[in-house]
Interface confidence: low
């Protein structure tokens, strides 16, 4: 291993080195050769390298005291080298107006203290984007803030006080966007023990989809450190960052439609929220809106979704039909109606789990019903969950990545629909793919609202 | 116990019709697929039809498609095979059959189920078969 | 359609005998094949599907295997209530027929 010759370190922090270096950098300890005390180049040497120059250290190579001072500082959770959600290039909200829920909160402030250091921290990333938060305190949130201690459900365990204080998730459904924070830590409004603002400001900035900074003087760089509150700012990388997914706060053309206007059925930009075959109609769902395309036909009608269904709420987000039932399942957040020959059924809604989706499922992006072989695909985030129908049961095995089983599709989709006996129709943002699944492969690419002769 | 017992069969004029019967015991229909299974003499199995009865889906043969028609009456719990327009190359001892699916376990199915199919179409229980006679 | 080529169509062996029996799919088929035991006036017996995990019941002796769109039957010690007819027979959600069987091998005393 390649020790500095002037330092003598204990086993101890070379086990620790390489156990920073494998949760930070993406080193694989399995792939290091067994006599590691001759080990001379390359894998170790490259991601200490990598750490020294991505946090601003010289870079050595070495493990020297600077480095193991650094792997010892105070740290967010969330790895430099992104296998974490794969935050960069990865997901944004695909809105503009995002909800936050404080899950449960830490004995070592005031409740009030909490809500400000969190609203502050959440307006600090309004302010230089056209985002608008709003904290909500029953039901599904876009961000769930969480304090917790140790392994606690998510496949990364914090590690008692000091070292990791805290972790976000990328957005998405379930589990995407939240921030846990450790709550070994002690957490406070100033300066002692560790100040909550100034980390959920950093772990807010992953729950929009950000990853870490190399600059020193970025909130989203790795590792604490306590500015004054009072005059802290983000820096222009940050800005640069989060402006690069969101747009300035004046640009507001990707907001959602307000709710009283008709989406223009020809924009390019069109998206839908959920699509899915009721015999031999399309309904295509958008905000309080659907389309209703009869097959062969060219014209189309649109109407409020209240006036087919009072009881059912706007925004629609996933659906799909089993047509030998006269059944069509309709999705939002956690919750699900089901429409019995074009009429909504009694006793619903009901929760999305029932159908065996894990807790931290909170919503269905799409959903399509196979009548090949009675088996329908929940698309949830990057993933997807296989359903059978007739035993009312999850398939084992789920759930898969999107993209390593439709190949093309993904790695997140708006909407789908089968058709045709052969083909599924894939929806992302304003782009539509004619999928053929005995083929296993993408046959036609079209836009969105190709299927109204725009 | 699983028992499939098939009725129905016997000699027919070409161009006459017959209907077979599968009464199932020991299990629910509705939810399993079934299938017909027709053996000429002397000659190898051919798959005739499938359903699943709770959605009443079906699956033919080309050579019976738009004669025949497999339907089931979960009620009675049976499965039932119309076959009109009947020719000399339909005589066979027709077996009715359930899908293994319904049967396996569920930690069975965790090794077995693959990305796009789970374990299809794969026959357990079979009737002592009924012969049908289609001559002159 | 898919076909399945099973060979040989007859053979001749001992109690004793490692008997194996060959079904070639015309396409693949992933690992969706069974094979089934049939004596004469008697339905059909399942004793392997996906390709190789055993039914319930059934001897050890028997075993399936793929290699490719090749698949196995082998009956490692053959006994004599294992003269019969044997049958491959594919299937799958996404072929038109589902399901196809091979034309038998006949396992005859030697």
């Known amino acids: 291993l390649p020790l500095n010759s002037s330092t003598s370190l204990e086993k101890n922090n070379v086990l620790f080195g390489e156990r920073y270096l494998e949760k930070f950098y993406g080193l694989e300890i399995n792939k290091l050769p067994v006599t590691k005390m001759k080990y001379s180049g390359n894998l170790m040497k490259e991601k200490i390298q990598e750490m020294q120059h991505f946090l601003g250290l010289k870079v050595t190579g070495q493990l020297d005291t600077s480095t193991l001072e650094m792997m010892h500082a105070p740290r967010c959770g969330v790895p430099d080298v992104h296998h974490f959600r794969e935050m960069p290039g990865g997901p944004v909200w695909r809105k503009h107006y995002i909800t936050y829920r404080i899950n449960n909160y830490t004995p070592d402030m005031n409740r009030e203290d909490v809500d400000y250091a969190i609203r502050k921290a959440f307006q600090v990333w309004s302010n230089v984007t056209p985002l608008k938060f709003s904290k909500i305190n029953t039901g599904m949130a876009d961000i769930l803030v969480v304090f917790a201690r140790g392994a606690h459900g998510d496949f990364h365990a914090f590690d008692g006080k000091g070292g990791i204080l805290a972790h976000a998730f990328g957005p998405g459904s379930g589990i995407g966007g939240d921030a846990h924070f450790d709550e070994d830590e002690f957490w406070t409004t100033h300066s002692g023990g560790t100040n909550l603002f100034l980390t959920a400001v950093h772990e807010i900035g992953h729950s929009l989809g950000l990853g870490h900074s190399s600059d020193p003087k970025a909130v989203m760089f790795p590792t604490y450190k306590y500015v004054d509150i009072n005059t802290f700012r983000l820096s222009a990388d940050d800005i640069r960052g989060i402006q690069s997914l969101y747009g300035d706060p004046k640009e507001n053309q990707r907001l959602p439609n307000p709710d009283n206007s008709e989406p223009a059925l020809c924009d390019p930009n069109l998206s839908f929220d959920a699509v899915t075959t009721v015999g031999n109609k399309i309904f295509f769902f958008k905000d309080r809106f659907f389309w209703l395309k009869v097959s062969e036909r060219p014209k189309t009608s649109v109407n409020l979704i209240s006036s087919l269904w009072p009881t059912l709420p706007s925004g629609i987000e996933a659906a799909y039909e089993i047509e030998a039932r006269n059944q069509v399942f309709l999705f939002k957040d956690d919750k699900y109606w089901l429409i019995s020959n074009l009429r909504p059924e009694p006793n619903y809604p009901k929760s999305i789990h029932s159908f065996g989706f894990p807790n931290f499922v909170k919503k269905i992006d799409a959903a399509v019903f196979n009548p090949r072989f009675y088996r329908t695909y929940f698309f949830v985030d990057n993933q997807y969950w296989r359903y059978d129908e007739r035993r009312q049961m999850m398939d084992p095995g789920y759930p898969k990545l999107i993209t390593k089983n439709f190949q093309g599709i993904g790695p997140k989709i708006d909407a789908v629909f089968y058709s045709k006996n052969k083909y599924y129709y894939f929806f992302q943002g304003s782009n539509q793919f004619e999928y053929d699944f005995l083929l296993q492969r993408i046959t036609k690419t079209l836009k969105s609202n190709s299927w109204f002769g725009c | 116990e699983v028992q499939l017992v098939e009725s129905g069969g016997g000699l027919v004029q070409p161009g006459g019709s017959l209907r077979l019967s599968c009464a199932a015991s020991?299990?629910?229909?509705?939810?399993?697929?079934m299938h017909w299974v027709r053996q000429a003499p002397g000659k190898g199995l051919e798959w005739v039809a499938s359903i699943y009865p709770s959605y009443g889906s079906t699956y033919y043969a080309d050579s019976v498609k738009g004669r025949f028609t497999i339907s089931a009456d979960t009620s009675k719990n049976t499965a039932y095979l119309q076959m009109n327009s009947l020719r000399a190359e339909d005589t066979a001892v027709y077996y009715c059959a359930r899908d293994l699916e319904e049967s396996l376990p569920k930690r069975a199915r965790t090794a077995v189920s693959k990305e796009l199919e789970s374990v299809p179409y794969v026959m357990d229980y079979w009737g002592q078969g009924t012969l049908v006679t289609v001559s002159s | 359609d898919i076909q399945m080529t099973q060979s040989p169509s007859s053979l001749s062996a001992s109690v004793g005998d490692r008997v194996t029996i060959t079904c070639r799919a015309s396409q693949s088929v992933s690992s969706a094949v069974a094979w089934y035991q049939q004596k004469p006036g008697k339905a059909p017996k399942l004793l392997i599907y996906s390709a190789s995990s055993l039914y319930s019941g059934v001897p050890s002796r028997f075993s399936g295997s793929r290699s490719g769109t090749d698949f196995t039957l082998t009956i490692s010690s053959l006994q004599p209530e294992d003269f019969a007819t044997y049958y491959c027979?594919?299937?799958?959600?996404?072929?038109?027929?589902?399901?196809?069987f091979g034309q038998g091998t006949k396992v005859e005393i030697k």
């Open positions: 020991g299990f629910n229909l509705s939810y399993s697929y």
């Open positions: 027979q594919q299937s799958s959600h996404y072929a038109s027929p589902p399901i196809t």
